[in-house]
Interface confidence: low
């Protein structure tokens, strides 16, 4: 492969916003490879060498009064300006989450399992995901992937609940997000529909069989008792 | 007090590759970058271009200054080259996977430098290029880089995927594998037993019950026909 030595210069002009644009901090940062060597910080008001490598630049740039004035004004002319231009599609961007709940492993009931609450495609990243079992919040056994940035202005996160699902239990994943006016909830019941229908079929069939058997025996023996004294002797039907 | 939002205009220039990048970042997401070859602004989401504009020529001027600064710093550092930092690679999907439901595989390449990387998607071991897309090199707070590669796909049990990453910090290409993990249906043993037993007992009960009902009714009818002696 290509084994030639590499040399990298990075520059980062940063605008940090607090409480909208009420407080703004501007940083002008220069890097050689990953090492920052000189910076302008609006909280300081002049360039400072971060390492010895940046001392010549700090001295030279601080001697240029026009440049310093320009950098001192950057919180307004650059930061607040760009914030205003981009605000409607960045700061105000809201995309609501898609929420799906499923068991991580397909285990039978009463076996240790991991219930997954998959929250996808939302923006911004601030999100609150909670697990509830039969209406009670579950705080232990909750594991999260943390916030995952998809790189396309959406986020996703998986929040898992370690549990032993029991028949009839209702698990609820509750999501709160700036795009939602009220929390979004998705339920998972501790019995699959096929399992439920099998149980119903079995129990239903059993009960129906017992009813028929009971009715049959009742009718048969009632008639046996009711006519026993009236039967003519010697003849069998 | 933690800031609410951060906007970063990030630039780099790399020698001897003579590659440069100019991009704007909002809270870790790219707003746009400038295509140096085409000299045009490329918005990360098409809709952004309807809200704002950026003159690409300004970025080219900045990159020229970055190049000049790099040459000064290279000499000043006594030609100290960069130390390669190999990437961490993760493959994930855009949303929960369902068979034959369109989805997107995301290959997340993180914590590396210098910003040069070769990424290939493999389906069943063969390179795939249809529909693939990627981001530019995205800045990190530790001044290393991140990058995303995307592959739209239709999940199936037959196909396996790999994201192959080559970087100077790696001794050999790094492959991250992904395949559809088909959930096996629950055994439902108890339910099956209850269902089978219940239906069997039910059926037997219905048959025997019906026989008894018929016999009982016949007996009743016979007795009524004969009447008392």
């Amino acid at each position: 492969g290509d084994t030639r030595p590499r040399f990298l210069e990075q520059v980062k002009h940063e605008c940090h916003f607090f409480n909208g644009t009420e407080r703004v901090r501007f940083l002008d940062r220069y890097f050689y490879h990953q090492e920052e060597y000189v910076r302008f910080d609006s909280d300081v008001g002049e360039y400072r060498a971060v390492t010895e490598l940046g001392r010549p630049d700090a001295e030279y740039w601080n001697s240029q009064k026009d440049l310093l004035e320009q950098k001192r004004a950057a919180v307004d002319t650059y930061c607040r300006h760009n914030y205003g231009v981009g605000e409607s599609f960045t700061v105000q961007r809201r995309v609501y989450p898609e929420v799906t709940v499923y068991p991580a492993k397909t285990q039978p009931l009463q076996h240790h399992n991991l219930l997954v609450c998959s929250v996808n495609g939302f923006y911004p990243g601030s999100i609150e995901v909670r697990w509830f079992r039969n209406g009670q919040e579950e705080k232990t056994g909750v594991v999260s992937t943390g916030l995952i940035q998809n790189g396309d202005w959406t986020f996703q996160t998986l929040v898992m609940l370690e549990t032993v699902p029991r028949s009839g239990e209702v698990y609820t994943c509750q999501v709160e997000h700036p795009s939602l006016t009220s929390p979004l909830t998705v339920e998972w019941r501790a019995r699959s529909e096929s399992a439920q229908s099998k149980m119903l079929s079995g129990v239903g069939g059993f009960v129906l069989g017992l009813l028929f058997l009971g009715a049959g025996l009742f009718i048969y023996f009632r008639n046996q008792k009711g006519h026993s004294g009236l039967q003519p002797t010697g003849f069998l039907s | 007090i933690k800031e609410e939002h951060v906007i970063i205009q990030a630039e780099f220039y790399l020698n001897p590759d003579q590659s440069g990048e100019f991009m704007f970042d909002f809270d870790g997401d790219e707003i746009f970058h400038v295509d140096m070859a085409k000299k045009e602004t490329v918005w990360r989401l098409e809709e952004f271009g309807r809200f704002a504009s950026f003159e690409a020529q300004g970025a080219l001027a900045n990159i020229a200054v970055d190049k000049a600064n790099l040459e000064i710093m290279t000499k000043r550092s006594n030609y100290t080259p960069i130390t390669n930092v190999p990437p961490e690679v993760t493959v994930l999907t855009n949303s929960p996977v369902e068979l034959r439901e369109p989805n997107v595989l995301i290959c997340f390449i993180d914590k590396f430098t210098p910003p040069v990387v070769n990424v290939t998607w493999l389906r069943n071991g063969k390179p795939v290029t249809t529909g693939v897309s990627e981001t530019v090199f995205l800045p990190r707070e530790d001044h290393l880089f991140r990058k995303f590669h995307y592959l739209p796909f239709l999940p199936s049990t037959e196909d396996v995927y790999d994201c192959r990453v080559e970087h100077w910090g790696l001794d050999e290409p790094l492959l991250k594998h992904w395949e559809f993990d088909a959930p096996s249906p629950l055994p439902e043993t108890t339910e099956n037993v209850v269902c089978a037993l219940g239906l069997t007992v039910g059926l037997v009960g219905i048959i025997i019950g019906t026989i008894f009902i018929i016999k009982g009714v016949r007996k009743s009818n016979a007795a009524e026909r004969r009447g008392p002696l």
Epitope: S179, L184, V186 | -
Partner: antibody, heavy 118, light 108 residues
Framework: QVQLVESGGGLVQPGGSLRLSCAAS????????MSWVRQAPGKGLEWVSA????????YYADSVKGRFTISRDNSKNTLYLQMNSLRAEDTAVYYC???????????WGQGTLVTVSS | DIVLTQSPATLSLSPGERATLSCRAS???????LAWYQQKPGQAPRLLIY???SRATGVPARFSGSGSGTDFTLTISSLEPEDFAVYYC?????????FGQGTKVEIK
């Protein structure tokens, strides 16, 4: 052809229940989010509820939350709206609509009229 | 909730004239998630524009959408007799999704 057909509308007393169905044909039903939108007589459109393609995510307007339940059966290509505790203000034509992108309906049924009156 | 206000409530124009319908949001809406619909009496709504400016399949070129942030516009460059109807805008950016109250385009 590509179409949506609603059914299940009718006259119901306040506090009563009704289940609307929407049969889809001519497209891969499971690939699309679906919505219910209603229109009170002589009034504008009001979004009621939406459900993702897999049925994993459901969304409701505040006015129906807790009373209405949206669901789908992808094997039957059918969308449902279970409406409980109906009120007079729920009287409307209910449209079933196919989502486009993030639920912008691009295909609509002809609607089914629900009248809540004593 | 995001409130969409359409203006004017009624627009009286003649065939061949240009119609400009406005839709204003109470807060910023991502333009990817704004749609326009046409509804004629006794019929279901029909999607005209999605993503603020993309024409839906089969929609004539005389219909165009524009705008961003809080202000969106539907323009019918030259009204045809079949264009007289009620037009609604809808945002599907934030839950709950909301519609404007509608603009009726009637024959003058």
């Amino acid at each position: 052809q590509v179409q949506l057909v609603e059914s299940g509308g009718g006259l119901v007393q306040p506090g009563g229940s009704l289940r609307l169905s929407c049969a889809a044909s001519g497209f891969t039903f499971s690939s699309y989010a679906m919505s219910w939108v209603r229109q009170a007589p002589g009034k504008g459109l009001e979004w009621v509820s939406a459900i993702s393609g897999s049925g994993g995510s459901t969304y409701y307007a505040d006015s129906v939350k807790g009373r209405f339940t949206i669901s789908r059966d992808n094997s039957k290509n059918t969308l449902y709206l279970q409406m409980n505790s109906l009120r007079a203000e729920d009287t409307a034509v209910y449209y079933c609509a196919r989502g486009y992108g993030r639920y912008s309906p691009d295909l609509w049924g002809q609607g089914t009229l629900v009248t809540v009156s004593s | 909730d995001i409130v969409l206000t359409q203006s004017p409530a009624t627009l009286s124009l003649s065939p061949g004239e240009r119609a400009t319908l406005s839709c204003r949001a109470s807060q910023s809406v991502s333009s990817s998630y704004l749609a326009w619909y046409q509804q004629k009496p006794g019929q279901a709504p029909r999607l005209l524009i999605y993503g603020a400016s993309s024409r839906a399949t089969g929609v004539p070129a005389r219909f165009s959408g524009s705008g961003s942030g809080t202000d969106f516009t539907l323009t019918i460059s030259s009204l045809e007799p079949e264009d007289f109807a009620v037009y609604y805008c809808q945002q599907y950016s934030n839950l709950p999704f909301t519609f404007g109250q509608g603009t009726k385009v009637e024959i003058k």
